[in-house]
């Protein structure tokens, strides 16, 4: 029987900069029941606070609701693991909410085959940013990535769309049914999950010739 091993806070994420959650990995338990507590203070403060919500984020997590989340202050936090034989602390972790945003997937993905008479046909893909992200404030720059593949293919073809919310793809296999998805990330945040797939049938007369 030993004191607990050192825990590690390894992940913090915010869906929209208004709330966030951090998760830790326990160290070894020393063969005894172990209690974990997360304490934090904000830059410019000395007063330590305990995690406001150990439930919402699941096991080994701390959730900071709206009233506990500030974009203007860096959070300094650590986890304490305690059993009957002693305690151990994680390293201090610094968190700036701006840099942990992982948005929801883009919405309203629409895919259409365009066949203008005077130009090559193309696949036109359009989407909207996730609802929770406020792009009007200016500090959120969302970047987008599209992936598509014929229904039975194993490999995805990936296109980086930058900040655009629409995209054209010229090279497609005629007569195939394609799956199309899109995801987004803030410039210094994390990729969202992929949006639900949209299916599009490419006409047999879709030509890739110049």
């Amino acid at each position: 029987q030993l004191p607990p091993g050192k825990p590690e806070i390894f992940k913090c994420r915010s869906p929209n900069k208004e709330t966030f959650t951090c998760w830790w990995r326990p160290g070894t338990d020393g063969g005894l029941p172990t209690n974990y507590s997360l304490t934090y203070h904000r830059e410019g403060e000395t007063l330590m606070h305990e995690c406001p919500d150990y439930i919402t984020g699941g096991p080994n997590s701390c959730h900071f609701g709206k009233q506990y989340t500030s974009m203007w202050r860096t959070y300094i936090m650590m986890v304490n693991a305690t059993n009957q034989m002693g305690s151990s602390f994680s390293d201090e972790l610094y968190v700036d909410v701006t840099y942990i945003v992982q948005p929801d997937p883009p919405l309203e993905l629409a895919v259409e085959v365009k066949q203008p008479e005077d130009r090559k046909p193309y696949l036109w893909i359009k989407w909207s940013p996730p609802t929770l992200i406020d792009l009007k404030t200016g500090w959120f720059t969302l970047l987008y990535e599209i992936r598509l593949k014929p229904e039975k293919a194993a490999e995805w073809e990936i296109h980086f769309a930058g900040q655009q919310t629409e995209f054209k793809i010229l090279s497609l296999h005629p007569g195939q049914k394609y799956l199309v998805q899109v995801r987004c990330k803030p410039d210094h945040g994390y990729w969202s999950a992929w949006s639900p797939a949209t299916f599009i049938q490419i006409p047999s007369d879709f030509t890739m010739n110049d």
Partner: antibody, heavy 118, light 112 residues
Amino acid sequence: QVQLVQSGAEVKKPGSSVKVSCKASGYTFTSYWIHWVRQAPGQGLEWMGEIDPSDSYTNYNQKFKGRVTITADKSTSTAYMELSSLRSEDTAVYYCARSFFTNWFAYWGQGTLVTVSS
Amino acid sequence: DIVMTQTPLSLSVTPGQPASISCRSSQSLVHSNGNTYLHWYLQKPGQSPQLLIYKVSNRFSGVPDRFSGSGSGTDFTLKISRVEAEDVGVYYCSQSTHVPFTFGGGTKVEIK
């Protein structure tokens, strides 16, 4: 404890490439961005670019765009910085540095001296 | 790119005396999220840089309270209230509000 251990000094010819490694330990490698900063002899610090090891997303200083490639190998917890078309002005100590969930550099490697000389 | 200008270039200080380093940026360092990402690093002789102050005025873990940072917008200052022998080295200001991140030219602090 957190450690960033860099590869050893290199001497390279003008026009060639160099690849510097930065092996991370003491933390979950995919959690935090790794940055590369260089320092020419007797000069100040110059940020070259950064990588998010979780998905290998990169941002580069445009000054080096096209010449620098930053990569990360999750299986070995190692980040790499490759600089091509070397010239004498690229003679410098190259540092890797790690952020938290922030955009400043809390931990630094020991530096790797790259000398470009014919 | 944001240009960071430090003054003075070098500073010779008697132990126990105060020291002050100025850093000016070519444009405002206030991020669109309201934060100011101006930081100070110290590079001791033969060592890698180390973080002293983040976001203008916050001491990093383990940094003695004789170091303090202040300023806003484009003008920033690092103060050492009482210089000690271990404080020698080159001090750099750095901004990470705008990409590419940039550093000042450095201020060399020596002991008289």
